[in-house]
Amino acid sequence: EKLPKAPVITTPLETVDALVEEVATFMCAVESYPQPEISWTRNKILIKLFDTRYSIRENGQLLTILSVEDSDDGIYCCIANNGVGGAVESCGALQVKMKPKITRPPINVKIIEGLKAVLPCTTMGNPKPSVSWIKGDNALRENSRIAVLESGSLRIHNVQKEDAGQYRCVAKNSLGTAYSKLVKLEVEVFARILRAPESHNVTFGSFVTLRCTAIGIPVPTISWIENGNAVSSGSIQESVKDRVIDSRLQLFITKPGLYTCIATNKHGEKFSTAKAAATVSIAEWSKSQKDSQGYCAQYRGEVCDAVLAKDALVFFNTSYRDPEDAQELLIHTAWNELKAVSPLCRPAAEALLCNHLFQECSPGVVPTPMPICREYCLAVKELFCAKEWQAMEGKAHRGLYRSGMHLLPVPECSKLPSMHRDPTACTRLPYLDYKKENITTFPSITSSRPSADIPNLPASTSSFAVSPAYSMT
């Protein structure tokens, strides 16, 4: 009769590599007498004999996983016990190997230029797949803007037009490669004006063409506004080339106006717009005051409220469809331009512009606007804003578009009446008188004769030494 013998595992369990849906077998050969009872555990949890996912044969020495799932990963142990001595155990790992699989593929994306785009690409696989991206037919290179994240997603910071195109992600491990479908990244660009319409000073009855060029994706549409309303006359010609729209508005000029070009394009439910304005003025318009049609009334706007004299009547030009609104829009546009000028120039220019656009008015039978006195205009031009004026004229000559004051509706000083000829025929700017006395950076002041009735002037006369042309007394 055989002697009892404690169990000995003669073939210890080894690590088993298995592909998903394939068969995996662990062998646990045991020598013992009497025959042992063999049980199996996965991650220390007993595998039940009646679990149909497993097959246990050869008196329990063979464990077969019939169709491996990725959740079967873990440590498998066989435990042999026959009552003689202690139970013995051997363990081995099951590593579930898996070809790459893309679980969350990228989708088509529309993104606005400058924003961040993320194209997802979540993968599964063992070994863990490496993820790369292809744009068009070429492998995509990472840089400071473009990165493949740990998750496999592609992140593009500050999206540029050139990022548009077809993308696919590639997941690769030692067992194979998976490709996503091609997806499209479309980059949309806010409407932007490339070429703003230019302001014109023309004679009554001339033809003027205002040109406005805009770019954007999708291609913008351009509309024109005249003094705040849709353009009522004139013809518009448009052409589109390489996502650039060129619009030309031809006008027959019978009145001055503020013309605004508005470029608009749509991004989903939202619109982006860009605006640029130009003034069309009629040469000698302000000179022929007798022909001016308009009315005198109190100023109700916001922009010039602090500049114009309280309760003063100002002139509203009825050549505009809505004079109050048109003149307010002109001054508002001008005001924004003034943000660029120096602190010395700005208040003086504001005083000049407000009093030029909203001229003091004598009601009478024919409402008559009173232009600014030439001397005050020249003081702004040659003293307070000399630097800005020179820059503006220089840029205008070189054909450049905008410089602080370029688009401002500034008067032509030489055409304004002199306060020496008729002090009642023109408007003074008290601000300048006050500043003249209070700013120490002025040129030296000479005295020669008694002062006229200008607010805040001392009894002695003062003339700016810069030029006798604008002596303010």
């Epitope: 705040g228 009315y295 005198c296 009334a297 109190q298 100023y299 109700r300 706007g301 916001e302 922009v303 409220d305 309280k310 309760d311 009547l313 809505d322 109050e324 609104d325 307010e328 829009l329 508002h332 009601p363």
Partner: antibody, heavy 121, light 112 residues
């Protein structure tokens, strides 16, 4: 079609607060001044507050100054009236109205249907 | 603060002409007050008729006209229609002290 739709009215106790909103559609909201006008039951119209197209200034009837605040969100095409320290004399239908131009003052060429504010204990 | 005055009530026969006025308790109404006129029928929101003294809003019948009459602003209805029976309000811009827009007390117009 141009529309102004007021909301936010209701019953509030004296000293309480309400915020009225006016949702605008059918026109370029940021090109126009806006106003609030109220009408007490059986009484006439009373201008309350105004704001220009860009929200750069605000104007109020003397009796509501310091208690009411008008504001606008041009992106949301919405006009607001925040009413604090409400009094029984503020009870009225509050109309939101559109100006015919950019500046705050002038003819009100489009009106909402109004929202009733009742201040009572 | 100045009060804007209007006739409390007026009546007119269909086809007749009626003039509503708008004054100031102190002083005259001028173009600087930019007189505006509104019509309100029961249960409805107001509707603007005339702005800045004499400009008619689009869609407003030509029988409505605005003007000055002495030191007041005036709204004239020439050839009154039954549907013109309503409350009429004038509103004035007051810019002198603090800026304000002031409505008159309204005129109840009856078309008999």
């Amino acid at each position: 079609e141009l529309q102004l739709v007021e909301s936010g009215g209701g019953l509030v106790q004296p000293g309480g607060s309400l915020r009225l909103s006016c949702a605008a559609s059918g026109f370029t909201f940021d090109d126009y001044g806006m106003s609030w006008v109220r009408q007490a039951p059986g009484k006439g119209l009373e201008w309350v507050s105004a704001i220009p197209w860009n929200g750069g200034s605000t104007y109020y009837k003397e009796s509501v100054k310091g208690r009411f605040t008008i504001s606008r969100d041009n992106a949301k095409k919405t006009l607001y009236l925040q009413m604090n320290s409400l009094k029984s004399e503020d009870t009225a239908v509050y109309y939101c109205a559109k100006r015919s131009g950019r500046i705050a003052f002038g003819a009100l060429d489009a009106w909402g249907q109004g929202t009733l504010v009742t201040v009572s204990s | 603060q100045a009060v804007v005055t209007q006739e409390p009530s007026l009546s007119v026969s269909p086809g007749g002409t009626v003039t509503l006025t708008c004054g100031l308790s102190s002083g005259s109404v001028t173009s600087s007050n930019y007189p505006d006129w509104y019509q309100q029928t029961p249960g409805q929101a107001p509707r603007a008729l005339i702005y800045s003294t004499n400009s008619r809003l689009s869609g407003v019948p030509s029988r409505f006209s605005g003007s000055f009459s002495g030191n007041k602003a005036a709204l004239t209805i020439t050839g009154a229609q039954p549907e013109d029976e309503a409350d009429y309000y004038c509103a004035l811009y007051m810019g002198s002290e603090s800026r304000n827009y002031v409505f008159g007390g309204g005129t109840k117009l009856t078309v008999l």
